[in-house]
């Protein structure tokens, strides 16, 4: 959480002289109230936006913007605290609007905006506009909060920032995963321009739980310099447990700018449609279960295996 | 792959306390906030609040203010709510869900039952 | 607080239909808005946040349309896994409230 670094910031609008300034987040009308203050921000609307630093990076900003209400209080406001608090983390930064000069009524809503907040993929934030002096304890709030979720690295918007590309965002595998057999399980992806190596992690679920039934790993070595953006199969061996159907194949990369936190890619395969109408019953019960694949578990290693292959 | 594992059913006497916990796998606890919701017997989902593990900061929904508080411990990735001064009326399947607004991952549910 | 109020409460349809489930709430939201799908002895799976964007693992046949007050979740084909109770949610602001739920059910 930072402000954009190389930009000016402007406040001043036809009718208002204002400046930007940075903020403790604490305003001086906290420790010394004052009697009369104005009432709170209207609507506050905030957007996300995507803006280049000095440095050419594009990053995610939050866009603020709210208007005021139509009412005498605009006498008595002197500016505006602008905060940003990071939900999990509980970091906050603050800038303030102080004017200069004093608010008069026109003919259209006094408006602000503010998109300097530089903020981070898949987080969560709570953005407050305080109007400025604060006011006395006890007294009306004179603030208005709303919550923002930025998106992650896999929205439109966020892929082509620095960030997102720093950890993959870019590399598009368009996973494949069909079902052989009852055991076997082929992926197919397309390998990025990299000669770094992949992790093929496959979890498998019963038909209608979300509590794994078979997990497994599989290793898949750095490609060479030929093979990059060709597609790669990879043929995983199920266990053989009776509905443990629902298949869950997850592709982390381990690209030089994000090591062990890229992006993973994900694809699921359900479980078979049932029939609707039931099995027959057949005429007779034999008294005993043939001894071939009746058991649960394959007679080998039962973590699974795999191979792969490279397509040119 | 997240889960989130909760602790089992609890069935406890008017005025009493519960504590559910919440195990955390596949991610670190302190990446996200862990948010608490509950769902009484065939109704909807009501939040409680959220906890941030990175930071300790609560937020409650005020009608449970005072009489929830919810902790992590990191250093076994589990989250816990403790609910007081139990009702008859809090009897719900208490679910922990990770995240703070839109709430990704969620434990199976705990089923307390208030009843004397 | 803000109130989320959904429509229909119970939904019939056949496999294959469309299903569209509705959702207000009683002030502007923007788009912070969470689709949530409960299986009977199931926890609640995010589908959809931002009113628009899909969650991991969320197939396509899943979108949702609007802003403001009025939300529209849309299932294009339902399959038999989508017969379910549907949830909307707001993160607007504190405290987080969801809807009453809708029943999709196979007609």
């Known amino acids: 959480l930072r402000l954009l670094d190389h930009r000016a910031l402007v406040c001043s609008q036809p009718g208002l002289n204002c400046t930007v300034k940075n903020s403790t987040c604490l305003d001086d009308s906290w420790i010394h109230p004052r009697n009369l203050t104005p009432s709170s921000p209207k609507n506050i609307y905030i957007n996300l936006s995507v803006s280049s630093t000095q440095h050419g990076e594009l990053v995610p900003v939050l866009h603020v913007e709210w208007t005021l209400q139509t009412d005498a209080s605009i006498l008595y406001l002197e500016g505006a605290e602008l905060s940003v608090l990071q939900l999990n983390t509980n970091e906050r930064l603050c800038v303030r609007f102080e004017f200069l000069s004093k608010l008069r009524h026109h003919h259209r809503r006094w408006r602000f905006t503010f998109s300097h907040f530089v903020v981070d993929p898949d987080q969560e934030y709570e953005v407050t506009v305080h109007h400025l002096p604060k006011p006395i304890p006890d007294g009306d709030p004179n603030h208005q909060s709303k919550n923002f979720l930025v998106p992650d690295c896999e929205h439109a918007r966020m892929k082509v920032t620095t960030p997102c590309m720093s950890s993959g965002s870019l590399w598009d595998p368009n996973i494949t995963v069909e079902t052989l057999d009852t055991q076997h399980l082929r992926v197919d992806f397309t390998l990025w321009n990299e000669s770094t190596h992949y992790q093929i992690l496959l979890t498998s679920f019963p038909h209608m739980e979300n509590h794994s039934c078979f997990e497994h790993m599989h290793h898949i070595p750095a490609p060479r310099p030929e093979e990059f953006h060709q597609r790669s199969n990879v043929t995983l061996t199920l266990r053989n447990l009776k509905g443990c159907c629902r298949h869950q194949v997850q592709i982390q990369p381990f690209f030089s700018s994000c090591l062990n936190d890229c992006l993973r890619h994900s694809a699921t395969v359900s479980c078979p449609e049932m029939p609707d109408t039931p099995e027959p019953i057949p005429d007779y019960m034999p008294l005993w279960e043939p001894r071939s694949g009746s058991s649960d578990y394959k007679d080998d290693d039962d973590k699974g295996s795999s191979h792969h292959h490279h397509h040119h | 792959q997240v889960q989130l594992v909760q602790s089992g059913a609890e069935v406890k006497k008017p005025g009493a306390s519960v504590k559910v916990s919440c195990k955390a796998s596949?991610?670190?606890?302190?990446?996200?906030?862990i948010s608490w919701v509950r769902q009484a017997p065939g109704q909807g989902l009501e939040w409680m609040g959220w906890?941030?593990?990175?930071?300790?900061?609560?937020k409650y929904a005020q009608k449970f203010q005072g009489r929830v508080t919810m902790t992590t411990d990191t250093s076994t990735s589990t989250a816990y709510m403790e609910l007081r001064s139990l009702r008859s009326d809090d009897t719900a399947v208490y679910y922990c869900?990770?995240?703070?607004?839109?709430?990704?991952?969620w434990g199976q549910g705990t089923l307390v039952t208030v009843s004397s | 607080e803000i109130v989320m109020t959904q429509s229909p409460a119970t939904l019939s349809v056949s496999p294959g239909e469309r299903a569209t489930l509705s959702c207000r709430a009683s002030?502007?939201?923007?788009?912070?808005l969470a689709w949530y799908q409960q299986k009977p002895g199931q926890a609640p799976r995010l589908l959809i946040y931002?009113?628009?964007t899909r969650a991991t693992g969320i197939p396509a046949r899943f979108s949702d349309n609007g802003s403001g007050t009025e939300f529209t979740l849309t299932i294009s084909s339902l399959q038999s896994e989508d017969f379910a109770v549907y949830f909307c949610?707001?993160?607007?602001?504190?405290?987080?409230?969801f809807g009453g739920g809708t029943k999709v059910e196979i007609k």
């Open positions: 869900a990770r995240r703070q607004l839109a709430l990704d991952y």
């Open positions: 596949g991610y670190t606890l302190t990446s996200y906030g």
């Open positions: 906890i941030s593990a990175y930071s300790g900061n609560t």
């Open positions: 002030q502007s939201i923007s788009s912070n």
């Open positions: 931002g009113a628009s």
């Open positions: 949610q707001q993160y607007d602001t504190w405290p987080l409230t």
